[in-house]
């Protein structure tokens, strides 16, 4: 419809138009995590705040039980930041002792679950070795990209070690998605 | 209006439609910073290039005095990257000497100021301990997320240490926002 | 057209409207890189998967020979993540030996090529010193921002060392763009 008049005489069906304000959108923020069971061979999923402070869901994008539920097929921009904080890694000690040196690491995965498909799909992964010199370390991993999703798909954020997630501030650890 | 015809007979008021090209948008790029006063208990704000090179503001999104001014209420995607560079942190020396080991850190905060609200709101924070082995270090912190903003809100980028910001290239340190 | 009726009587030309679903979009994912020639004074460009797995191009956004080709002028959000992995940096040894200590580094650049312009334009750069203690290290660099592009512009992702790019998973290293 680019640059085209809306003339009254023709009853043509146009390509779908829609108001931007009614598109599914969500921005979720961190809460303190509690230990929970998770599927074998899958990192644990974070749970989120969805209505207090900066957090919101709108236009049929719902949050339930660690998942963002996609209400409408289309292309979505999906993003998350997880800030990790921990104490000294043993990495340097391991190295000095000459033992095998598999580095400690922190990992964030944004995962899509489709009920009709047996295996979750990893959409985005940020993974970083952690071999810090100082006694307290902290750092964020940020992810964001566009994906074609189907109505009914579910999104979650998984992390390698749930006890290292910085839950203290809503601006440090967050998860969001919006229909383009 | 998804998949609906525009028929001439009904005078219905549709959900607001608008051309994407007239939405408020800005991409600001780094300039050399000069020391300035800043509020107590708040990191100093960066100032930005808004019209030269890759930088632009459009459709009533204006930049003035370190702030991006939001001209219209709605959901915005806001992003920033700040590249820091510095010399060796004293972290390892502090640790060896047995002194209190609070690591050096670098922090970026995207802050919203609403005139009717007394306190600024921190929308996004990226914070990282810096305890580097090498004598010169450099690294970026990237942030981006979606927020519901009101007409008249102001956005700024604050950093923990303005003297560590790499101002040398417009592609290394930047700040932007656009209405979804 | 915000909040305005579509009345049958007036033949006014509205600001361009267009269906979101027909906007140019692409998300490309990593493949194993092969050594290739590249321009002097320019980092090598990555090549990408554009149709298998999570990767796609749509609505005239085409991928060819390491480039995303922009089919329509407008403001685009462009993003990339590159995950690097390597062995111990010599950084600490260099430092101990008293030799000049230029740290090892990893760099990602998103570059725009305009045929009518002799030099490529660097849109985004993420660069990080690497001076790891552990013997194996890995880490991502993420970039994303909005730029005004012209029809015919070409986008590519350049990296400082193509042999350090983690090509093993499509969620670790990727490149995308979409018209806003």
């Amino acid at each position: 419809l680019k640059g085209q008049e809306f003339a009254p005489s023709h009853q043509q069906v146009y390509a779908p138009l829609r108001a931007d304000g009614d598109k599914p959108r969500a921005h979720l923020t961190v809460v303190r995590q509690t230990p929970t069971q998770h599927f074998k061979n899958q990192f644990p999923a974070l749970h989120w705040e969805h209505e207090l402070g900066l957090a919101f869901t709108k236009n049929r994008m719902n949050y339930t039980n660690k998942f963002l539920l996609i209400p409408e097929s289309g292309d979505y921009f999906i993003y998350s930041q997880v800030t990790f904080r921990g104490m000294t890694s043993e990495c340097s000690e391991i190295r000095q002792a000459g033992r095998p040196n598999k580095p400690d690491s922190i990992t964030v995965v944004i995962t899509k679950v489709t009920d009709s498909y047996p295996e979750p799909t990893q959409l985005l992964m940020g993974t970083k070795s952690v071999c810090e010199v100082g006694s307290n370390w902290f750092q964020p991993i940020y992810l964001g990209a566009m994906f074609s999703l189907q109505e009914g798909d579910k999104l979650m954020v998984n992390v390698s070690d749930i006890s290292l997630v910085d839950y203290t501030k809503e601006d440090k650890t967050f998860f969001g998605a919006f229909l383009l | 209006l998804k998949g609906q015809e525009f028929a001439p007979s009904h005078q219905q008021v549709y959900a607001p439609l608008r051309a994407d090209g007239d939405k408020p948008r800005a991409h600001l790029t780094v300039v050399r910073q000069t020391p300035t006063q800043h509020f107590k208990n708040q990191f100093p704000a960066l100032h930005w290039e808004h019209e030269l090179g890759l930088a632009f503001t459009k459709n009533r999104m204006n930049y003035t005095n370190k702030f991006l001014l939001i001209p219209e209420s709605g959901d915005y995607f806001i992003y920033s990257q700040v590249t820091f560079r510095g010399m060796t942190s004293e972290c390892s020396e502090i640790r060896q000497a047995g002194r209190p080991n609070k690591p050096d850190s670098i922090t970026v905060v995207i802050t919203k100021v609403t005139d009717s609200y007394p306190e600024p709101t921190q929308l996004l924070m990226g914070t990282k301990s810096v305890c580097e082995v090498g004598s010169n270090w450099f690294q970026p912190i990237y942030l981006g997320a979606m927020f519901s903003l009101q007409e008249g809100d102001k956005l700024m980028v604050n950093v923990s240490d303005i003297s560590l910001v790499d101002y040398t290239k417009e592609d290394k340190t930047f700040f932007g926002a656009f209405l979804l | 057209l915000k909040g305005q009726e579509f009345a049958p009587s007036h033949q006014q030309v509205y600001a361009p409207l267009r269906a979101d679903g027909d906007k140019p979009r692409a998300h490309l994912t990593v493949v194993r890189q092969t050594p290739t020639q590249h321009f002097k004074n320019q980092f090598p460009a990555l090549h990408w998967e554009h149709e298998l797995g999570l990767a796609f191009t749509k609505n005239r956004m085409n991928y060819t020979n390491k480039f995303l080709l922009i089919p329509e002028s407008g403001d685009y959000f462009i993003y990339s993540q590159v995950t690097f992995r390597g062995m111990t940096s010599e950084c600490s040894e260099i430092r101990q030996a008293g030799r000049p200590n230029k740290p090892d580094s990893i760099t990602v650049v998103i570059t725009k090529v305009t045929d009518s312009y002799p030099e490529p334009t660097q849109l985004l750069m993420g660069t990080k010193s690497v001076c790891e203690v552990g013997s194996n290290w890995f880490q991502p660099i993420y970039l994303g921002a909005m730029f005004s592009l012209q029809e015919g512009d070409k986008l590519m992702v350049n990296v400082s060392d193509i042999s350090l790019v983690d090509y093993t998973k499509e969620d670790k290293t990727f490149f995308g763009a979409f018209l806003l």
């Epitope: 230990p35 929970t36 104490m87 006694s135 307290n136 070690d161 749930i162 006890s163 839950y167 203290t168 | - | -």
Partner: antibody, heavy 116, light 107 residues
Framework: EVQLLESGGGLVQPGGSLRLSCAVS????????VDWVRQAPGKGLEWLGV???????NYNSALKSRFTISRDNSKNTVYLQMNSLRAEDTAVYYC??????????WGQGTLVTVSS | DIQMTQSPSSLSASVGDRVTITCRAS??????LNWYQQKPGKAVKLLIY???RLHSGVPSRFSGSGSGTDYTLTISSLQPEDFATYFC?????????FGQGTKLEIK
């Protein structure tokens, strides 16, 4: 529901060794930290060490490397190996799980008595 | 190591009383201050984490405040089940350290 159950306590002679176990249920050890804490009779709590979800460990340096924390993920069990035990190691030993800064869930404890 | 000094070491109070326990750290602990409740023969319970945030299932009569080095636990109206020993703990730096405890007894 998160549960932690300590076992392996008892009477041991000075200079001897003992291995305590902490069986956990309700979460996976690969994704959550487990701490050991002890309490001498009539005294306060003393943090001994932690094994993080990623497998790294940290210890209270006051223990002079006499204690080692390990785990068996397949059994969902964390261990505290205590060597060169002294009378002052007599205490109730607790395992606890939590975030990086606090211990959210605790076991009931197991009593270790070091005496000749 | 960071020293945690808790006061008082013991306290007698009645049901319905407002009670305050303080904890001082030997250096700034950046709000990483937690409070625990211990009763004989029961598992230790986390009450408050990160200075002021209530752990799940903890009654709202418990509250925490403070910053820097000085922190406070307040019970607004004592209930019979609140008579126990309370410990503070800093979670900012390893090794984690506890206060020596405050025994809250019925007057």
């Amino acid at each position: 529901e998160v549960q932690l159950l300590e076992s392996g306590g008892g009477l041991v002679q000075p200079g001897g060794s003992l291995r305590l176990s902490c069986a956990v249920s309700g979460f996976s050890l690969s994704s959550y930290g487990v701490d050991w804490v002890r309490q001498a009779p009539g005294k306060g709590l003393e943090w001994l060490g932690v094994i993080w979800g990623f497998g790294g460990t940290n210890y209270n340096s006051a223990l002079k490397s006499r204690f080692t924390i390990s785990r068996d993920n397949s059994k969902n069990t964390v261990y505290l190996q205590m060597n060169s035990l002294r009378a002052e190691d007599t205490a109730v030993y607790y395992c606890a799980s939590g975030n990086f800064d606090a211990m959210d869930y605790w076991g009931q404890g197991t009593l270790v008595t070091v005496s000749s | 190591d960071i020293q945690m000094t808790q006061s008082p070491s013991s306290l007698s109070a009645s049901v319905g009383d407002r009670v305050t326990i303080t904890c001082r750290a030997s250096q700034d602990i950046s709000n990483y201050l937690n409070w625990y409740q211990q009763k004989p023969g029961k598992a230790v319970k986390l009450l408050i984490y990160y200075t002021s945030r209530l752990h799940s299932g903890v009654p709202s009569r418990f509250s925490g405040s403070g910053s820097g080095t000085d922190y406070t636990l307040t019970i607004s109206s004592l209930q019979p089940e609140d008579f126990a020993t309370y410990f503070c703990q800093q979670g900012n730096t390893l090794p984690f350290t506890f206060g020596q405890g405050t025994k809250l007894e019925i007057k």
